[in-house]
């Protein structure tokens, strides 16, 4: 019980992480202009991994692609890449460990196999999660590099004469949705490893004895029983348990006269 | 067609209160901000503040502050300027307008007069 | 607060031929996220509300004449009437729509030679 309850809730840990991690990628504000001891300005900056955005006081929000590969910074590819495996990883760890879970009962898979799979989700889970907090944390550092830089120059301009602001960026929403959403699907995978301990097939080996009957000499030596043990726990009379698909669950806009999006 | 209306003409005293309205048709009044522009007889143009019509907020230029408050009633579409403690300098056109594209002030009122005299 | 200064004050031009007012502004007025630059162009004809001309420095409102023309980035900007008309006659003001406050230059009189 204990084991499915581990795998059940390392699943549910996961999915969210995932569904997080996918989230987190596609959001745009994984860096925001920061307000901080910033001239008052009537336009708002953010960017995404895929866009960035403007919204002006007026509500309107304009959002332009990168619509190029080889002019964007080797940073922002690195992290690119790392979501999208951390994605990936995740979703066919989600695959694996649906046919893993203890609850779902497929033709006639055995426990080892399930086991198996188990830790090959759980495996995928953590990397997954790993992929996620890394790309996120690379952001963040490209970020805090970036606001020192242009802290240190933040007026430029001919001899102070006319002045141009630099945009200052800080952490966006982003940021803390990949590292909560990268955390659950490491917690996840590691829910799952350790349900696969409780899985997997036991060989008990006895020595053989000797059983002495009236007259006869036969010698017993029993194989290796299969032992499912939950943790200990007595599973002689077993119960499969069909368990149901179970689902998880400002602004001023200004008319639009044109489509930029 | 975007329209906004605005209150008659004010005669007033130094020191008393005056209400001016922009009431406005022809689009979702939450979806525009509102600009008040205050322009002094054969003199330039001089932007007082907004009001977000959806929040509520207000933001008001550096010499509008105190005296002057923006207000809204979003079931009458309609904005206000409320001025009080009214001074001699005080008289001049006052003008809503919406802001656009590029916090551009899209729309105007027709402009309401406000005389200040003892 | 962001000062607007255009030149020339006012301006003298004959029917048909172009006429040019500059503006300019204390700081930079273009926004790094979209490369647009926040300045408006209005007119005001007397006895009249200004009227949207030109916003994000170049852009043309609808309904504007196409012989009106907006150009410049950063600091220094142009509104351009290809062909003066005489309806043109009016005040113009450019308007930082960047920062707040939102302030206007002074203003440029537009009559005909």
């Known amino acids: 019980m204990a084991v499915t309850a581990c795998q059940g809730l390392g699943f549910v840990v996961s999915l969210i992480g995932i569904a997080g991690i996918i989230a987190a990628t596609c959001m745009d504000q994984w860096s925001t202009q920061d307000l901080y001891n910033n001239p008052v300005t009537a336009v708002f900056n953010y960017q995404g991994l895929w866009r960035s955005c403007v919204r002006e006081s007026s509500g309107f929000t304009e959002c332009r692609g990168y619509f190029t590969l080889l002019g964007l910074p080797a940073m922002l590819q690195a992290v690119r890449a790392l979501m999208i495996v951390g994605i990936v990883l995740g979703a066919i760890g989600l695959l694996v460990s649906i046919f893993a879970l203890k609850c779902i009962r497929i033709g006639s898979m055995e426990d080892s196999a399930k086991a198996n799979m188990t830790l090959t989700s759980g495996i995928m889970f953590i990397v997954s999660g790993l992929c996620a907090i890394a790309g996120v944390s690379v952001f963040a550092n490209m970020l805090v590099t970036n606001f020192w830089m242009s802290t240190a120059n933040m007026y430029t301009g001919m001899g102070g004469m006319v002045q141009t602001v630099q945009t200052r960026y800080t952490f966006g929403a982003a940021l803390f949705v990949g590292w909560v959403a990268g955390g659950l699907t490491l917690i996840g995978g590691v829910m799952m490893c350790i349900a696969c301990r409780g899985l997997a097939p036991e060989e008990t080996n006895y020595k053989a004895v000797s059983y002495h009957a009236s007259g006869h000499s036969v010698a017993y030596k029993p194989g290796g029983f299969k032992a499912s043990t939950g943790f200990g726990s007595n599973t002689k009379n077993k119960k499969i348990y069909d368990g149901g698909a179970r689902t998880e669950d400002e602004v001023q806009s200004y008319p639009s006269k044109h489509d930029y999006v | 067609q975007v329209q906004l209306v605005q209150s008659g003409s004010e005669l007033k005293k130094p020191g008393e209160s005056v209400k001016v309205s922009c009431k406005a048709s022809?689009?979702?009044?939450?979806?525009?901000?509102m600009n008040w522009v205050r322009q002094a007889p054969g003199q330039g143009l001089e932007w007082m503040g907004w009001?977000?019509?959806?929040?509520?907020?207000?933001t008001y230029a550096d010499g509008f502050t105190g005296r002057f408050v923006f207000s809204m009633d979003t079931s009458a579409s309609t904005a206000y300027l409320q001025i009080s403690s009214l001074k001699a300098e005080d008289m001049a056109m006052y003008f809503c307008?919406?802001?656009?594209?590029?916090?551009?002030?899209?729309?105007w009122g027709q402009g309401t007069l406000v005389t200040v005299s003892s | 607060d962001i000062v607007m200064t255009q030149s020339p004050d006012s301006l003298a031009v004959s029917l048909g031929e172009r006429a040019t007012i500059n503006c300019k502004s204390s700081?930079?007025?273009?926004?790094?996220?979209?490369?647009?630059?926040?300045l408006t162009w209005y007119q005001q004809k007397p006895g009249q509300p200004p009227k949207l001309l030109i916003y994000w420095a170049s852009t043309r409102e609808s309904g504007v004449p196409d012989r009106f023309s907006g150009s410049g980035s950063g600091t220094d900007f142009t509104l351009t009437i290809s062909s003066l008309q005489a309806e043109d006659v009016a005040v113009y003001y450019c308007q930082n729509n960047y920062f707040y406050p939102f302030t206007f230059g002074q203003g440029t009189k537009l009559e005909i030679k």
């Open positions: 022809g689009y979702t009044f939450t979806n525009y901000g």
């Open positions: 009001i977000n019509t959806y929040t509520g907020e207000s």
């Open positions: 700081q930079s007025l273009l926004n790094s996220g979209n490369q647009r630059n926040y």
């Open positions: 307008a919406t802001l656009g594209y590029g916090n551009s002030l899209a729309y």
